[in-house]
């Protein structure tokens, strides 16, 4: 069965210092899937951030960078210059 596992449950981030979120795929080969990232904020709203290849939700393209690491079978989301408004729970998902 396919499973996407976050590398860390909690990621402490400093304002302005680039941060990387990683999701490991188990049981399947990541290159065969489109990876999506979402953010859930306090109001329980799920906001779309990124989908392969190079598709970003409104307002996310300048500060977020999505990618996959074929070698490590990982999905990666970089926050280039984190600020307080980037706080929340981030979710990775996949589809074909």
């Amino acid at each position: 069965a396919i499973e996407l596992v976050p590398e860390h449950q909690t990621v402490p981030v400093s304002i302005g210092v680039p941060a990387t979120l990683r999701c490991s795929m188990k049981g399947e080969a990541i290159g065969n899937y489109y990876i999506n990232w979402y953010r859930k904020t306090q109001g329980n709203t799920m906001t779309f951030i990124y989908r392969e290849k190079d598709i970003y939700g409104p307002g996310f393209k300048d500060n977020f960078q999505g990618d996959i690491d074929i070698a490590k079978n990982l999905a990666v989301l970089k926050i280039l210059a984190p600020s307080e408004r980037d706080e929340g729970s981030y979710y990775c998902a996949c589809d074909t």
Epitope: E3, M25, K26, A29, I30, G31, N32, Y34, A71, T96
Partner: antibody
């Protein structure tokens, strides 16, 4: 046991396009990456390229301008087109399944665990 | 995409151990723990012997082992047997867009 079988013309004229198909039998085409690798007579192996089941591709940089790969998951087949061939493209062409899963479900790319028997392609007029 | 460097030939007597080296660069062998080794008998397709540097696929004898140090990977065959005589190729993942093979090593069992 999954098996791979290459098919296509054994003789191609210079400047024409070499076209090969690999059929995956006794197993699914999902869960792995699919590759073409060639071997000129008496020489070493050369990676041509890979295709993912969603259709994305990676090609050997030295062949990139001439290579196109495609996949048809409904038929359990993937294909190679190599354009503008010359005598230097004469080789045995293998299709191969890439990737190995360990007991924990971790996937390791870069390992070609199942190969076709190879098909000889000669470029000559 | 230059190939990895292997010795053209190695030889050993039955029962002995031999090691085949595979030297790459920091862009391939040195950057990824994804070196694989293949055995190829004349007229046959290659067979995977080692993956991810040192892991053995099921069904492969524990006489075959792999290791890596820096930009060089190695395949060791212990207790050499006549059926081990073949060509051996190393291969390294070199980023999502490339895979490189070694030039091959002919193993002769004396």
């Amino acid at each position: 046991q999954v098996q791979l079988q290459e098919s296509g013309p054994g003789l191609v004229k210079p400047s024409e396009t070499l076209s090969l198909t690999c059929t995956v039998s006794s197993g699914s085409i999902s869960s792995y990456y699919w590759n073409w690798i060639r071997q000129p007579a008496g020489k070493g192996l050369e990676w041509v390229g890979r295709i993912y089941t969603i259709g994305n591709t990676n090609y050997n940089p030295s062949l990139k301008s001439r290579v196109t790969m495609s996949i048809d998951t409904s038929k359990n087949q993937f294909s190679l087109n190599l354009s503008s061939v010359t005598a230097a493209d004469t080789a045995v062409y293998f299709c191969a399944r890439e990737g190995y899963y360990d007991s924990s479900g971790s996937f390791f790319p870069g390992a070609f665990g199942i190969w076709g028997q190879g098909t000889m392609v000669t470029v000559s007029s | 995409s230059s190939e990895l460097t292997q010795p053209a030939s190695v030889s050993g007597s039955p029962g002995q151990s031999i090691t085949i080296s595979c030297t790459g660069t920091s862009n391939d062998v040195g950057s990824y723990n994804l070196v694989s080794w293949y055995q190829q008998h004349p007229g046959k397709a290659p067979k995977l012997m080692i993956y991810a540097g040192s892991k053995r696929p099921s069904g492969i004898s524990n006489r075959f082992s792999g290791s890596k140090s820096g930009n060089t990977a190695s395949l060791t065959i212990s207790g050499l047997q006549a059926e081990d005589e073949a060509d051996y190729y190393c291969c390294s993942f070199a980023g999502a867009t490339n895979v490189v093979f070694g030039g091959g090593t002919k193993l002769t069992v004396l």
